[in-house]
């Protein structure tokens, strides 16, 4: 079964900078990746970036840079302008779509015990109905 993993990392040198790493584990090619914060795609989440494997990326503040790391993983750099660093308590979600085969989504956040510079362990939080688009024709 395909799976999505999410890691949230605080930069050691810049405490207001965060990076979200997401990856897709499974067969098939990815046609679109959507990154949101505050909840899953379409369920209260706010879009941060959309990445297409051939057509490029689109991003919205506070996203700073979205990029592909491999054919099945992406990273999104975020700049937290607020003094209270709300990112530390925020959920980030990544949705990998493979049209028309299916879409899969998981969420993650910075662990409370994280020291700056240490990446969160890859513990995906599956979203119920994440594979509701998994059709067979």
């Amino acid at each position: 079964t395909p799976e999505v993993w999410v890691q949230v990392q605080m930069e050691a040198t810049e405490l207001s900078s965060f990076t979200v790493h997401c990856g897709f584990l499974g067969p098939g090619s990815i046609s679109l990746v959507t990154v949101s914060w505050g909840g899953p795609d379409g369920a209260g989440g706010t879009k941060l970036a959309v990445l297409h494997p051939e057509l490029g990326t689109r991003q919205w503040a506070p996203a700073r840079q979205a990029r592909w790391e491999t054919q099945s993983s992406i990273s999104l750099a975020l700049e937290d302008s607020g003094a209270s660093s709300p990112f530390a308590n925020t959920t980030f979600c990544c949705k990998f779509a493979s049209f028309p085969e299916g879409s899969w989504e998981s969420c993650g956040s910075l662990p409370p015990s994280s020291d700056p510079g240490l990446s969160a362990p890859p513990t995906p939080v599956p979203i119920l109905r994440a594979d509701h688009h998994h059709h067979h024709h």
Partner: nanobody
């Protein structure tokens, strides 16, 4: 995620018409295009038509003048009126909502698809 349910597919003779409908579970304001893709066995998947958030319809060259895409915001429904159908229009048609990259509507959510068969 947005639930999309297509209807209106079927079998028709060449030159005939069909009207596809797509009911969305909720308003899709967080994406910026809504449209139709099609996939025929052994052929490349293609975007048939979509409507931007500004309401402008866009069509693939092969259906211009024959297909018309429209929306009913009150019913959260997308339509595709298909006239002068040709055998090469036979395919599974998917309703999609997505994000614009230039003139392309990249699917973020889609329905299960409805089959259109045009016989000569």
């Amino acid at each position: 995620q947005v639930q999309l349910v297509e209807s209106g597919g079927g079998s028709v003779q060449a030159g005939g018409s069909l009207r596809l409908s797509c009911a969305a579970s909720r308003y899709t304001s967080r994406t910026d295009c809504m449209g139709w893709f099609r996939q025929a066995p052994g052929k490349e998947r293609e975007g048939v038509a979509h409507i931007d958030s500004d309401g402008i319809p866009r069509y693939v060259e092969s259906v211009k003048g024959r297909f018309t895409i429209s929306q009913d915001h009150a019913k959260n429904t997308l339509y595709l009126q298909m006239n002068s159908l040709k055998p090469e229009d036979s395919a599974t048609y998917y309703c999609v909502v997505g994000f614009k990259f230039g003139d392309y509507c990249a699917p973020n959510d889609w329905g299960q698809g409805t089959q259109v068969t045009v016989s000569s």
